[in-house]
């Protein structure tokens, strides 16, 4: 139904706390460089205005769209051009072009320092003094670094953050309580960020149809007892919600997400037997719980889908009459039978089936032509299965750090033109797949591995798009979203690359490395490894192992030395010389 004042409608639906949080996220995602204090001032102004509209929907400007209201606020910021350059040009445009312009200026890799967690005591003091401000800072810091973070989900993580602090700040050893719990929240939030970025990429590059296909496959896997019509309804709603969030309509997105959760809980009988526990929770937790829900049990004795999709003489007629419905049904039937496949694989199979019908239905004997489609699926299924097997075996052999290094070497050889920090970030994230997925039961490994890798590679594509340097990466990133992972896996050593000349300063280290946290030490070593590969793309595994082993020993020895600086200064050049020799 139409509302006189959209902002009043959203304020009433969401409540003041969530409304303010979402407005803060929206502003932080659009203007990523503004300090918290500036944003919070805008948030308060918008909230006060929304309250006047709740009191009187006919009040001045209350009938304006939320984009108009938000855009006007952003464009009124003093010195916008000084801080944001050409983003200020957006302000000369009218809606909806102005909002589109803001979206195009979102920066996936903003020049912001890594978010440093304060000391436990300091954190607890500032949390206890002003919890609202503390959590506001959290929303702001995460949102500006992840401009596509799914806003209602970020509210959920802020709630989790709040829970952890409330619990741990009363403990005697605050750090021991906070560190593992906050690490767990951070890890989940980072994965959520790359997953949502992938959804927005899908929406931006390939439109709603592509996203809806993804949603149909995912929902069919989770709710195999639901009928196709139910799955289609859920997928349509989910597509709308994600379109809104990716498009910056965060209030509408969060409101619609809560509505979808409500609908699912009112219709459990036709969706899934697993929903009840989620439905007893408050709104943010309920939606999150439903998003992470385990798969319902597959009905036993589902028949072979060959009858309807291969053996039926009317396949071409059914396909021609309603292509999207027929293909949607195929995707639904296949996905509900295969929770052990990744969504990417299911979409590749559906795409293969569509291509087969397009070809065969134009031929003289269609059934004879499409009758072999099953055999044609085999390599598509075997490829990711083999990928999981070989990578999990390698992870089990090397552990996470060693596995990251193996991936780093592999990807630096594939795309040596890509900047070292980007390669290191990608390899570290790709390497985490082992810890995340390889320990799972067999049936959960493939979907976990492939869908996670796809999301990480999407991040690589998004960063590469900003400054394209590798033709191979551009080629993999330009193709279909579901073909990206196989495309990257198939890349080999880039023979066109002219090796980087050996620069001693790249491999010169100082005593400051000794005081770095383990993670930062690893990044330093991995940076050196990537640079080595760029210098010698065809270095053997043994050569790289020798050099990296030498390097580790050198750091270890000098960090234990009485005069660290002197050790690094004298031993460093020897290490560089030995490394050059080992790689000659």
């Amino acid at each position: 139904e139409a509302h006189k004042s959209e902002i009043a409608h959203r304020f009433k639906d969401l409540g003041e706390q969530h409304f303010k949080g979402l407005v803060l996220i929206a502003f932080s995602q659009y203007l990523q460089k503004c300090p918290y204090e500036e944003h919070i001032k805008l948030v308060q102004e918008v909230t006060d205005f929304a309250k006047t509209c709740v009191a009187d929907e006919n009040a001045e400007n209350c009938d304006k769209s939320i984009h108009t209201l938000f855009g006007d606020k952003l464009c009124a910021i003093p010195k916008l051009r000084d801080n944001y350059g050409e983003l200020a040009d957006c302000c000369a445009k009218q809606e909806p072009e102005r909002n589109e312009c803001f979206l195009q200026h979102k920066d996936d890799n903003p020049n912001l320092p890594p978010f440093q967690r304060p000391e436990a005591e300091a954190m607890c003091t500032s949390f206890q003094e002003n919890p609202t401000s503390f959590l506001g800072h959290y929303l702001h810091e995460v949102a500006r670094r992840h401009p596509y973070f799914y806003a209602p989900e970020l509210l959920y993580y802020a709630e989790k953050y709040n829970e952890v602090l409330t619990q741990c700040c009363t403990e005697s050893d605050k750090a021991a309580c906070l560190t593992p719990k906050l690490d767990a929240v951070k890890e989940k939030a980072l994965v959520a960020a790359v997953r949502q970025r992938m959804k927005c990429s899908s929406m931006q590059r390939f439109g709603e149809r592509a996203f809806k296909a993804w949603a149909v496959a995912r929902m069919s896997q989770r709710f195999p007892n639901a009928e196709f019509a139910e799955i289609t309804k859920l997928a349509t709603d989910l597509t709308k919600i994600n379109k809104e969030c990716c498009h910056g309509d965060l209030l509408e997105c969060a409101d619609d997400r809560a509505e979808l959760a409500k609908y699912m809980c009112e219709n459990q009988a036709t969706i899934s037997s697993k929903l009840q526990a989620c439905c007893d929770k408050p709104v943010l937790q309920k939606s999150q719980c439903l998003a992470e829900i385990e798969h319902d049990n597959i009905p036993a004795d589902l028949p072979s889908i060959a009858a309807d999709f291969v053996e039926d003489k009317e396949v071409c007629k059914n396909y021609a009459e309603a292509k999207d419905v027929f293909l949607g049904t195929f995707l639904y039937e296949y996905s509900r039978r295969h929770p052990d496949y990744s969504v990417s694989l299911l979409l590749r199979l559906a795409k293969k089936y569509e291509a087969t019908l397009e070809k065969c239905c134009a031929e003289g004997d269609p059934p004879a032509c499409y009758g072999t489609v099953l055999a044609e699926f085999q390599p598509l299924v075997e490829e990711p299965k083999n990928l999981v097997k070989t990578n999990c075996e390698l992870y089990e052999k090397l552990g996470e750090y060693g596995f990251q290094n193996a991936i780093l070497v592999r990807y630096t050889q594939k795309a040596p033109q890509v900047s070292t920090p980007t390669l290191v970030e990608a390899a570290r994230n790709l390497g985490r797949v082992g810890t995340k997925c390889c320990t799972l039961p067999e049936a959960q490994r493939l979907p976990c591995v492939e869908d996670y890798l796809s999301a990480i590679l999407n991040r690589l594509c998004v960063l590469h798009e900003k400054t394209p340097v590798s033709e191979k990466v551009t080629k993999c990133c330009s193709g279909s979203l579901v073909e990206r992972r196989p495309c990257f896996s198939a890349l080999t050593v880039d023979e066109t690359y002219v090796p980087k000349e050996f620069k001693a300063e790249t491999f010169t280290f100082h005593s400051d490395i000794c005081t770095l946290p383990d993670k930062e030490k690893q990044i330093k070593k991995q940076t050196a490894l990537a640079e080595l590969v760029k210098h010698k793309p065809k270095a053997t595994e043994d050569q790289l192992k020798t050099v990296m082993g030498d390097f580790a020993q050198f750091v270890d020895k000098c960090c234990k030395a009485a005069d660290k600086d002197n050790c690094f200064a004298t031993e460093g050049p020897n290490l560089v010389a030995r490394s050059k020799e080992a790689l000659a």
Partner: nanobody, 124 residues
Amino acid sequence: EVQLVESGGGVVQPGDSLRLSCAASGGTFSTYVMGWFRQAPGKEREFVSAISQNSIHTYYANSVKGRFTISRDNSKNTVYLQLNSLRPEDTALYYCAASRFTSWYTADYEYDYWGQGTLVTVSS
């Protein structure tokens, strides 16, 4: 991890019968689709027959329809293949396979667990 062990193979004359058995262990048998495949010397592995979890659906390759019968006993964690009117072209190594999730029943790549096989030789 499901383990499958086939038995019942042997040397028979054309027109004779055999009953193959496949005993499963290590998983919840009643949640698996069970299938039989065969591989003749020098040929590719081919689908023979499959049966759904509660025996509601059965599938057969055209070459064995009307001669072979698949059945299962979930209480004994065993699947059977009754081979009647055997022909020389039925000579092959017969494999039992289990699939937790399947769309096709007839596609070998949808089966995750395989036995070592039992040899059936039909010769006069």
